[in-house]
């Protein structure tokens, strides 16, 4: 239920801004206004703190994994949950916090030398002649090296903006993080009212292109604060 989500660790550990990895403050994206939670068929806003929707583990921060917030919950509603610490129960590597991995259903500390070998074996097996789905830790590890050998084109899945071709940034688009065009002059952008709020939106816009900044549209000065329209304008 929504209450159990709000009381869970997911809220204490909000994901990093999309477009930058955890701990990287420079986000390349601009969130559309209205922070929304996909619950049932309605989007609910709750005190500006929202679970972060996801489809796969690699869409979450480095210290999170993607799962349904309720036990045996609806597969249609998955959010980024805080990773499991050492000795906590797990079902796959991605559930365990960095420096740990899932062994016999428990998060255990990874002996670096040993564990690195295990991951490489998994990757080699999975990427033999077919393109099998990689689960958990191994899939995350491979994304940057295998999937992004060429820069992502518009609409392709990405983890960060450096995965995308020139003129594109990595931003959330409901089902995933994809490469989107950097905004041009006159295009609608989003001005973030408070630091950190842009990591929570289902749809994100890129930043304004070079020589442009996100400013309130001149003919919108009279509008109420909440509905003011911002566009990319020349400095």
């Amino acid at each position: 239920t929504l209450n159990s989500v709000l009381n869970s660790n997911a809220i204490k550990n909000l994901p990093p801004p999309l477009g930058g990895a955890a701990g990287h403050p420079g986000s390349a994206v601009s969130a559309a206004p209205g922070i929304l939670y996909p619950g049932g068929n309605k989007y609910q806003t709750i005190d500006n703190y929202q679970p972060y929707p996801c489809a796969e583990d690699e869409e979450c921060g480095t210290d999170e994994y993607c799962a349904s917030p309720t036990r045996g919950g609806d597969a249609g509603v998955q959010i980024c949950l805080a990773c499991r610490k050492r000795r906590k129960r797990c079902m796959r590597h991605a559930m365990c916090c960095p420096g740990n991995y899932c062994k016999n259903g428990i998060c255990v500390s990874s002996d670096q030398n040993n564990f690195r070998g295990e991951i490489e074996e998994t990757i080699t097996e999975s990427f033999g002649n077919d393109h099998s789905t990689l689960d958990g830790y191994s899939r995350r590890t491979t994304l940057s090296s295998k999937m992004y050998h060429s820069k992502g084109q518009e609409g392709s899945v990405c983890l960060r903006s450096s995965d995308c071709a020139t003129g594109l940034c990595c931003a959330r688009h409901f089902w995933s993080k994809i490469c989107k065009p950097v905004l041009k002059e006159g295009q609608v952008c989003t001005k973030h009212r408070r630091k950190g709020s842009h990591g929570l939106e289902i749809f994100q816009r890129c930043y304004c292109g070079e020589g442009l900044s996100c400013r309130i549209q001149k003919d919108h000065h009279q509008a109420s604060n909440s509905s003011r329209l911002h566009t990319c304008q020349r400095h």
Partner: antibody
């Protein structure tokens, strides 16, 4: 250039099954989510199903849940829709579409007719 | 369930401007601030014309523009041409259904 070509449509009796295929070319298939959208004769568009780039995440419209299965083979650049327990109301042109920024490329569609 | 309402038909003469509206509830068009528009010629596949309310994909004529006010999104076509005659669909999002389409609007170019 991006190309999506559907096949596998045809006439089938109510309760029957059909498997649609969509051959993709001109882009890195494994980097995109994909969808099936249908359009009944003279009617509007209805989203049917979507699948993540790796195939590990699938979503369905309520009207087809439990009857249709979406899948993909990234080594063959092909998207599939297995349709079971077909009903008269499933009669439509079925389009496969790339989920880039929204449904940015569509195939020409394949007609599925469910009739006795 | 989310529903998007579009007028069944709109018409205009060549050179004119026309606007097609798409009205939804606050949980979709109004809440999301994200609407897309598709054009579909008879017997053809739909084509994405506008995304994020007002952004045109490359290759789409700048005669097509999108806007949104409250719970209503609008597609405006200026300098109407014969080849604009088609069906137009708006689309937004539902948490479980992903893509939700409006009923479609048939645009007729007169003369």
């Amino acid at each position: 250039q991006v190309q999506l070509v559907e096949s596998g449509g045809g006439l089938v009796q109510p309760g029957g099954s059909l498997r649609l295929s969509c051959a993709a070319s001109g882009f890195t298939f494994s980097s995109y989510w994909m969808s099936w959208v249908r359009q009944a004769p003279g009617k509007g568009l209805e989203w049917v199903s979507g699948i993540s780039y790796s195939g590990s995440n699938t979503h369905y419209a309520d009207s087809v849940k439990g009857r249709f299965t979406i899948s993909r083979d990234n080594s063959k650049n092909t998207l599939y829709l297995q349709m079971n327990s077909l009903r008269a109301e499933d009669t439509a042109v079925y389009y496969c579409a790339r989920m880039g920024i929204d449904l940015d490329y569509w195939g020409q569609g394949t007609l599925v007719t469910v009739s006795s | 369930d989310i529903a998007l309402t579009q007028p069944a038909s709109v018409s205009g003469s060549p050179g004119q401007s026309i606007t097609i509206s798409c009205t939804g509830t606050s949980s979709d068009v109004g809440g999301f601030n994200y609407v897309s528009w598709y054009q579909q010629h008879p017997g053809k596949a739909p084509k994405l014309m506008i995304h994020d309310g007002s952004n045109r994909p490359s290759g789409v004529s700048n005669r097509f523009s999108g806007s949104k006010s409250g719970n209503t999104a609008s597609l405006t076509i200026s300098g109407l041409q014969a080849e604009d005659e088609a069906d137009y669909y708006c689309q937004t999002w539902d948490s479980l259904s992903f893509f939700v389409f409006g009923g479609g609007t048939k645009l007729t170019v007169l003369g």
